[in-house]
Interface confidence: low
């Protein structure tokens, strides 16, 4: 629909509260270093302007696009050049180039202080003193650290955040009530951010076709009773929503997501039998619930795929008439029959099918040529199955921490040029696949594991893209979205790597390690492990295990000592010397 004033249209659709929240998220995701107060001021100015347009859509500037209005507002920030450097050059451009320029300057790893959680009483006082500011601050802090966070979903997180404080700040034991809820929100938030980052990378780096293929596969698994036409409609709408959010068009995105949830619920009879509970929920919960809904049961007696896609004499004719539609139908039919496959595996199969048809439909005897295409799928299916089996066995044998350590060593040897914090973060997340997926029965392991690994490896890709240091990482990240995981799995030890020089300072520890949480202590130890491998890439598992066991004993001993700092200094020197000897450094 054409509206005289886009800003008035969105304000009316979304309501003031959400309009303000979404504009705050948008601004914080673009200008990640700006103080909270500056953003609130900008948001209030935009909101006041929007109200004038609601009152009179013909008022001055009300006909301007949202990009123009928001971009003009961002470009009024006085310290743009000092704070953001070359990003200030974006302001010299016209739309749509200016918005593209802002998007390119989004920073996946902004130089911001770690969020430290205050005492519960301090948080509750702040919540009660000014609930609105408290919640806005939450939106701001998450949005600036996660510049691709799915904005309508962040509204849902904020609602849960508010609910947690509302309930727990009046509980007898505030901390016991609140802290587990905040931990859960933090962990879910990080996972949600990473999943959305993959969607945006898919759209931005590989294009709409790649995203649509992913969506066809995933929605066909989830809604196997829906017709292909229905799935296609949902894919088109979903692609629009994510294109908007990834492009910074958060008001349009939130509005369209609400419309999509409404459509799904109004048509649930022709989509899925699993949607009833979701559709009884309020909007934000409803949208979240639909996005996470379990797969519907597969229709009984689905015919063999071979009839339409291998045996039919019309395969090449159908393919030639509408290539993407025919491939989409293949993907839909395959995915609805295989909820036990990962989406990326389904996309590999579809790619193999496409490549075969491209070759065979130009051959003298097309049918003879593509008759055995399904045989080519077997090794593609077995590779992730075997990998998951081996790694789940290793996880069950080692437990999460040691499994993470095994992956740390494995990945540091593959790509030792990558920064230590990135290797630690990515390997820890890769290691979480064990506790997340290995508990599942066989039929659910692959979609859980391989699609999760795609999300984690995308984190590596986006962090590496900011400061590229490894051609191998660049190659695996850019050649094929669906083959990223097999590409990384296939990497062997980098024989060209020149070991890092030994620096005793890297292995010097202090008494402050004793007061750290278990998680933070693990990260310290895992950081040391990565550094060890960078110094001695050819160290054996046994050598590294011995050094890490000594290190754990050293930390435990010194944390029990009366004079901890002296213990760390003296015993630390001995440990470094012993480790150097053990590793032949």
């Amino acid at each position: 629909d054409a509206h005289k004033s886009e800003v008035a249209h969105r304000f009316k659709d979304l309501g003031e509260e959400n309009f303000k929240a979404l504009v705050l998220i948008a601004f914080a995701q673009y200008l990640q270093q700006c103080p909270f107060e500056d953003h609130v001021k900008l948001v209030n100015e935009v909101t006041e302007f929007a109200k004038t347009c609601v009152a009179d859509e013909s008022a001055e500037n009300c006909d301007k696009s949202l990009h123009t209005l928001f971009g003009d507002k961002l470009c009024t920030v006085a310290t743009l050049r000092e704070t953001y450097g070359e990003m200030a050059d974006c302001c010299a451009k016209q739309e749509p180039e200016r918005n593209e320029c802002f998007l390119q300057h989004k920073d996946d790893n902004p130089n911001l202080p770690r969020l430290v959680r205050p005492e519960v009483d301090v948080m509750c006082t702040a919540f009660h003193d000014n609930e609105e500011t408290f919640l806005k601050k939450y939106l701001y802090e998450i949005a600036r650290r996660h510049p691709y966070f799915y904005a309508p979903e962040l509204l849902f997180f904020a609602k849960r955040y508010k609910a947690a404080f509302t309930e727990c700040c009046q509980a007898a034991d505030k901390a016991a009530c609140l802290l587990p809820k905040l931990d859960e929100l933090r962990d879910e938030g990080k996972a949600s951010s990473a999943k959305q980052r993959l969607k945006c990378a898919s759209l931005q780096k590989f294009g709409e076709r790649a995203f649509k293929a992913w969506a066809v596969a995933r929605l066909s698994q989830r809604f196997p009773k829906a017709e292909f036409a229905e799935v296609s409609k949902l894919v088109t709408d979903l692609t629009k929503v994510h294109t908007e959010c990834c492009h910074g068009d958060l008001l349009e995105c939130a509005d369209d997501r609400a419309d999509l949830a409404k459509y799904i619920c109004e048509n649930q009879d022709s989509i899925s039998s699993k949607l009833k509970e979701c559709c009884e929920k309020p909007l934000l919960e409803k949208s979240h619930c639909i996005a996470e809904v379990e797969n519907d049961e597969m229709p009984a007696d689905l015919p063999s795929l071979a009839a339409d896609f291998v045996e039919s004499k019309d395969v090449c004719k159908n393919y030639a008439e509408a290539k993407d539609v025919f491939l989409g139908m293949f993907l839909y039919e395959y995915a609805r029959r295989h909820p036990d496959y990962s989406v990326v595996l389904l996309l590999r199969l579809a790619k193999t099918y496409e490549t075969t048809l491209e070759k065979c439909c130009a051959a003298a005897d097309p049918h003879e040529c593509y008759a055995k295409v399904f045989d080519e799928f077997k090794p593609l299916v077995e590779e992730p199955q075997n990998l998951i089996k081996q790694n789940c066995e290793l996880f069950e044998q080692l437990g999460e921490y040691k499994f993470q350590n095994a992956l740390l060593v494995r990945y540091t040897k593959k790509v030792p040029q990558v920064s230590t914090p990135t290797l630690v973060e990515v390997s820890r997340n890769l290691g979480k696949v064990g506790s997340k997926c290995c508990k599942h029965p066989e039929a659910k392991r692959m979609p859980c594991a391989e699609d999760y690994l795609s999300v984690v490896l995308n984190q590596l890709c986006v962090l590496h893209e900011k400061t590229p240091v490894s051609d191998r990482v660049t190659k695996c990240c850019t050649e094929s979205l669906v083959n990223r995981r097999p590409c990384f799995s296939a990497l062997e030890v980098d024989e060209t790597y020149v070991p890092k020089e030994f620096n005793a300072e890297t292995f010097t520890f202090h008494a402050d390690i004793c007061t750290l949480s278990e998680k933070e202590r693990q990260i310290k130890k895992q950081t040391a492990l990565v550094e060890l491998v960078k110094h001695k890439p050819k160290a054996t598992k046994e050598q590294l295990k011995a050094v890490m066991d000594d290190f754990a004993a050293f930390v435990e001993k010194c944390c029990k000592a009366d004079d901890k700092e002296t213990c760390f200094a003296e015993e630390g020197k001995k440990l470094v010397a012993a480790s150097q000897a053990a590793l032949g450094l």
Partner: nanobody
Framework: EVQLVESGGGLVQAGDSLRLSCTAS????????MGWFRRAPGKDREFVGA????????WYSDSVLGRFTISRDNAKNTVYLQMNSLKPEDTAVYYC?????????????????WGQGTQVTVSS
């Protein structure tokens, strides 16, 4: 800011019926549950009932279950409370409210926006 306006209150006899309306000034994007509460003289505000935006789900307090019915007309941004078989103990100021959509619809603290209230008096 969403404004809520209740109407339809008044003085009735025990056993009579009354229909209250509550209209929202705008469609609350994130606030999809609308609830009714009441405050009897000298008592705390208590939950009466609530309805989801879709109208699929409704909740009622035990004291009104079977006598009161909540419905809504989304096109008009309006929610209704149909009260049948009224009793003197139903005398109260009735408030409508909009909840933010995070469960616990029986609790006042879940509701973001409140109307001014409309007086219902049931004489014996």
């Amino acid at each position: 800011e969403v404004q809520l306006v209740e109407s339809g209150g008044g003085l009735v006899q025990a056993g009579d019926s009354l229909r209250l309306s509550c209209t929202a000034s705008e469609r609350p994007f994130m606030s999809y549950v609308m609830g009714w509460f009441r405050r009897a003289p000298g008592k705390d505000r208590e939950f009466v009932g609530a309805i989801t935006w879709s109208g699929i789900n409704t909740w009622y307090s035990d004291s009104v279950l079977g006598r009161f019915t909540i419905s809504r007309d989304n096109a008009k941004n309006t929610v209704y409370l149909q009260m049948n078989s009224l009793k003197p103990e139903d005398t109260a100021v009735y408030y409508c409210a909009v909840a933010d959509g995070v469960g616990l619809y029986r609790y006042e603290r879940q509701y973001d926006y409140w109307g001014q209230g409309t007086q219902v008096t049931v004489s014996s």
